[in-house]
């Protein structure tokens, strides 16, 4: 039967009367342009919403905005348009909110042309009161926050000069001109390239890489013939132009830019690029772009240096033109990412990996689909997930995959069940273990939200037609229920609840349109008397992560450990709360090969798990060097997979060899690196 | 040459089936997909949906799910549409019609639609108390 | 699902003359679009695929055009032969759906 039509569904009773009672309604009293909504800090109830509208005259854009607050989840809004003056704020820069719960928030306000700085609006008591600041420039960029400390603020100039403020934006200070690009590394530092001649596009590839540790009282260059970084984990990228070409490659330190090592992966050609999929404290997801205008390129996986580099997947999609991916971390699982490849005939499949990139496998055919008509053989399929590259194209997929890390298992995403995606009506889908087995949890296309840690999910149907009407489900997308908001129905734009997935509330946003005007309004809903109790200890069982084969002594053994997890059971009805944290309990593995990954200057023949050393190193690909000089490198072989905890078991040894005779690089060297103070 | 040839005329009262046939020939069975589309009296074209000859897969339009089967026998190089459930509204010419470009969602090179090319003589279904 | 609007819904238009149909998506359909015409009592049959490239045996005063949203089949001088019913069609997304008709008709 159907998702949610099975009789042993366990219905919530009465919830009718219980979600009327926590239903509120508010209509903002401005007309239908943007809107944007901000939570200020975590668990305090506090969202900021901006909505602007736009009326294009024949020499000038007339612009208003209006600015609301609530303190109760979205309950009760009110105006707070008068704390900034009535200002315009410019919506392309967003609400600027300070990390953490600092409370701190910076709207930037849109200035008439010949004023000689921008505007500011800062607030330290989680939009309670706004003082108003006029700059000394005009913002390129959003103001960012130091990622340690909330009142040290950097913006990039329209005139591309760095300016930084100690004080949470009270006085700035230009610490250098003639800069591209600024990111907060730890510890209030500062990395930014420069261009010495024309122009940040002119100078492309001949950029220099600075640094200040200090606020700009003192710089160091720590790199030259820059054409990009990156920051990913512990790692900063660099990507150098090479002396004699106008090829590139990249170059990784983990010491803030004092050493550089030379990464051995593929250098890129002027077409091409790299991509930081994504990065943690142990390793790098690398794209490398295939040469061509082909759509495609190659994952590569680090080791813990972020300096040798194993294949991971062939033909990973990743636009060049619109720069879209489908790559995915899904958080409710350690070690599991999904992502799409390009086929031959120019298909798109999804691929999920559940060991960190080590192995990549096709998604397993839902249990209650049938295969559609990209399909060979009826019975045997895949599920392919609509992700960022459907959504760029249209495909009628209103939300990309879905998974916290506190609804440990969940994922819940839009797909097609057969060979590759199909351009067909999307359903969507839910996994409960991570992604290794998915069921087809709604018919057709929705917008869809996790509260209270998975207990409650809440979907809304993706539709052109107004509507008037939500489904939940308290037992993880098997049944549904559908709760009518509002007599009158509402054109649907989103549904927004407090990140982190703790909340029990959900607002529905969307416009009524009357004759002459249309209005945004939001309806919050509580879900807080729909879980009457707390959970308690008989409501959770112990699932073990990774689970794939009972009988086997590693059975769940991931990256050299295995994880219990207490999950709540699908068939209670009670509140994990908002102060709910996972429960696991890991125990280590014993070490086998697959916990190893082949060291430089070794690889591994296919279909066999030992590694091998390379008869030369030669090529491009190989060119390597460590801490940016010749150095006696020593290596066994192997390497342990960056983050494995294994233990015991098979452990590899190889005599140790020399091979700084084949080491070359064309990186700044420690001795050509030049300080600099103001 | 390339034909699609359809069963003949049907009557149905309501709350039956029907099953239609379309037989092909003059070309790889396996090598096009196939669409069905339909016609009301002094309507518009209407698309119910398509099959993959090769494995048999399909893929409705959502108007017409869980009413709509349909099959393939490649000995024959035949496929049926059978439809359920049939009201009033279902009285129409059914077609086949040959459809090369199948439904996978383009890569970055643009997906290129061929059009239905080829399309059987239709066959009238009437539902009738 | 995207919705395809034809218009006129009825074109009278005399033999010899040029006959411009329009035809418009709800959201672009890239080039993904296809022209049919039909007559009474007969299958419909395919004129124009690819939004421009036109069917074998099609004779070339038909001539489609346009990507996106807005497309047009033109006629560029009516034989007796060609009063029909006309209708778009679009592959881009499913399910596939057909434009209402345009009705050619001798003025």
């Known amino acids: 039967s159907a998702p949610g039509e099975d009789e042993e569904c366990g219905r919530v009773r009465d919830f009718v009367a219980k979600l009327a009672n926590n239903t509120h309604q508010h209509v903002f009293d401005d007309l239908r342009g943007s809107v944007s909504l901000s939570w200020v800090g975590d668990s305090t109830g506090v969202i900021l919403v901006l909505t602007t509208f736009h009326v294009p005259l024949v020499i000038m854009t007339f612009g208003q905005s209006k600015l609301y607050r609530s303190e109760d989840y979205g309950k009760n809004f009110k105006d707070i348009t008068d704390l900034i003056n009535n200002t315009f704020i410019r919506t392309e820069f967003g609400m600027a909110i300070g990390p953490e719960n600092s409370g701190k928030v910076v709207l930037t306000a849109e200035v008439s042309g010949g004023s000689r700085g921008g505007r500011i609006f800062r607030s330290s008591d989680f939009a309670k009161n706004f003082v108003q600041t006029d700059l000394p420039f005009h913002p390129l960029t959003q103001m960012m926050y130091s990622p340690q400390n909330s009142d040290y603020l950097l913006a990039l100039s329209t005139e591309n000069g760095l300016w930084v403020s100690k004080n949470f934006g009270g006085k700035w200070e230009e610490i250098h001109k003639a800069v591209c690009l600024a990111k907060w590394g730890s510890d209030n530092t500062i990395f930014f390239t420069t261009y010495a001649n024309g122009s940040c596009k002119a100078d492309l590839g001949a950029l220099e890489l600075w640094r200040t540790s200090d606020l700009g009282k003192s710089f160091k260059t720590i790199g030259v013939k820059i054409y990009s970084f990156g920051l990913g984990g512990r790692f900063l990228f660099a990507s150098v132009m090479a002396d004699k070409d106008t090829t590139r490659r990249i170059h990784v330190s983990t010491d803030q830019g004092d050493t550089w090592s030379m990464a051995q992966l593929p250098s890129v050609g002027q077409e091409q690029f790299y991509s930081i999929l994504a990065a943690n404290d142990d390793m790098v997801f690398m794209h490398v772009d295939e040469p061509g205008d082909t759509g495609f390129g190659t994952i590569f996986t680090s080791d813990d240096r972020g300096i040798v580099y194993s294949k991971s997947l062939d033909r990973h999609l990743y636009t060049t033109t619109g720069g879209e991916t489908d790559f995915t971390n899904v958080t409710s699982l350690r070690g599991v990412y999904i992502t799409s490849v390009l086929s031959e005939d120019n298909s798109i499949q999804t691929m999920i990996t559940f060991d960190q990139g080590g192995r990549w496998t096709h998604l397993r055919k839902p249990e209650n689909s049938e295969c559609d008509a990209t399909a060979k053989n009826k019975n045997e399929c895949s599920l392919h997930i609509h992700a960022s590259y459907s959504i760029s194209q249209k495909l009628n997929v209103p939300m990309a995959p879905l998974s916290e890390p506190n609804a440990v298992g969940i994922v819940i995403a839009h797909g097609s069940v057969g060979d590759a995606i199909s351009v067909m009506v999307p359903d969507v889908y839910i996994s409960d273990d991570g992604g290794y087995s998915w069921t087809k949890m709604l018919e057709g296309p929705h917008y869809y939200t996790i509260l209270d840690s998975g207990g409650i999910i809440v979907a809304a149907e993706h539709s052109s037609r107004p509507i008037n009407v939500i489904k939940f489900s308290t037992d993880e997308g098997q049944c549904w229920q559908t709760y009518t908001f509002t007599r009158d129905p509402i054109y649907f734009t989103g549904l927004a609840s407090e990140p982190g997935a703790r909340s029990m509330n959900i607002s529905i946003w969307g416009f009524t349109e009357s004759f002459l005007t249309s209005q945004w309004v939001s309806y919050t809903i509580d879900f807080k008397d729909i879980l009457e109790r707390n959970c308690e200890e008989k409501d959770y069982t112990i699932w073990l992560a990774h689970s794939t084969d009972p009988e086997d002594y590693e059975d769940g053994c991931i990256l050299g450990y295995k994880e219990q997890f207490l999950r709540l059971r699908k068939s209670s009805v009670c509140q994990n709360g908002r102060d709910y944290v996972v429960t696991k309990q890991p125990s280590i593995c014993l070490c086998s090969l697959e916990d190893f990954l082949c060291d430089f200057g070794y690889y591994r023949p296919e279909n066999d798990s030992k590694c091998v050393e390379q008869p030369e190193l030669k090529g491009h690909d190989l060119e390597f060097c460590l801490y940016g000089r010749e150095e006696h490198l020593t290596t066994n072989g192997y390497r342990k997979i960056p983050g494995d905890k294994c233990q015991g078991g098979v452990n590899p040894v190889r005599e140790v060899k020399d091979l700084k005779k084949k080491c070359t690089s064309n990186f700044l060297s420690p001795e050509k690196q030049n300080s600099k103070s103001n | 040459q390339v034909q699609l040839v359809q069963s003949g005329a049907e009557v149905k009262k309501p709350g039956a089936s029907v099953k239609v046939s379309c037989k092909a020939s003059?070309?790889?069975?396996?090598?096009?997909?196939m669409s069905w589309v339909r016609q009301a009296p002094g309507q518009g074209l209407e698309w119910m949906g398509i099959?993959?000859?090769?494995?048999?897969?399909?893929s409705y339009a959502q108007k017409f799910q869980g009413r709509v089967t349909m099959t393939r026998d490649t000995s024959t190089s035949t496929v049926y549409m059978e439809l359920s459930s049939l009201r009033s509204e279902d009285t129409a010419v059914y077609y086949c019609?040959?459809?090369?470009?199948?439904?996978?969602?383009?890569?970055?090179?643009?997906?290129?639609?061929?059009?239905?090319?080829?399309w059987g003589q239709g066959t009238t279904v009437t539902v009738s108390s | 699902e995207i919705v395809m609007t034809q218009s006129p819904a009825t074109l009278s238009v005399s033999p010899g003359e040029r006959a411009t149909l329009s035809c418009r998506a709800s959201?672009?359909?890239?080039?993904?679009l296809a022209w049919y015409q039909q007559k009474p009592g007969q299958a419909p049959r395919l004129l124009i695929y690819?939004?421009?490239t036109r069917a074998t045996g099609i004779p070339a005063r038909f001539s489609g055009s346009g990507s996106g949203t807005e497309f047009t089949l033109t006629i560029s001088s009516l034989q007796s032969e060609d009063f029909a019913v006309y209708y778009c069609?679009?592959?881009?997304?499913?399910?596939?759906?057909f434009g209402g008709g345009t009705k050619v008709e001798i003025k």
């Open positions: 069609q679009q592959a881009r997304l499913g399910p596939w759906t």
């Open positions: 003059g070309y790889t069975f396996t090598s096009r997909y």
């Open positions: 099959i993959n000859p090769v494995g048999g897969s399909t």
């Open positions: 019609a040959r459809d090369p470009s199948g439904i996978a969602a383009a890569g970055p090179a643009s997906r290129y639609y061929y059009g239905m090319d080829v």
């Open positions: 690819g939004a421009s």
């Open positions: 959201q672009s359909v890239s080039s993904n």
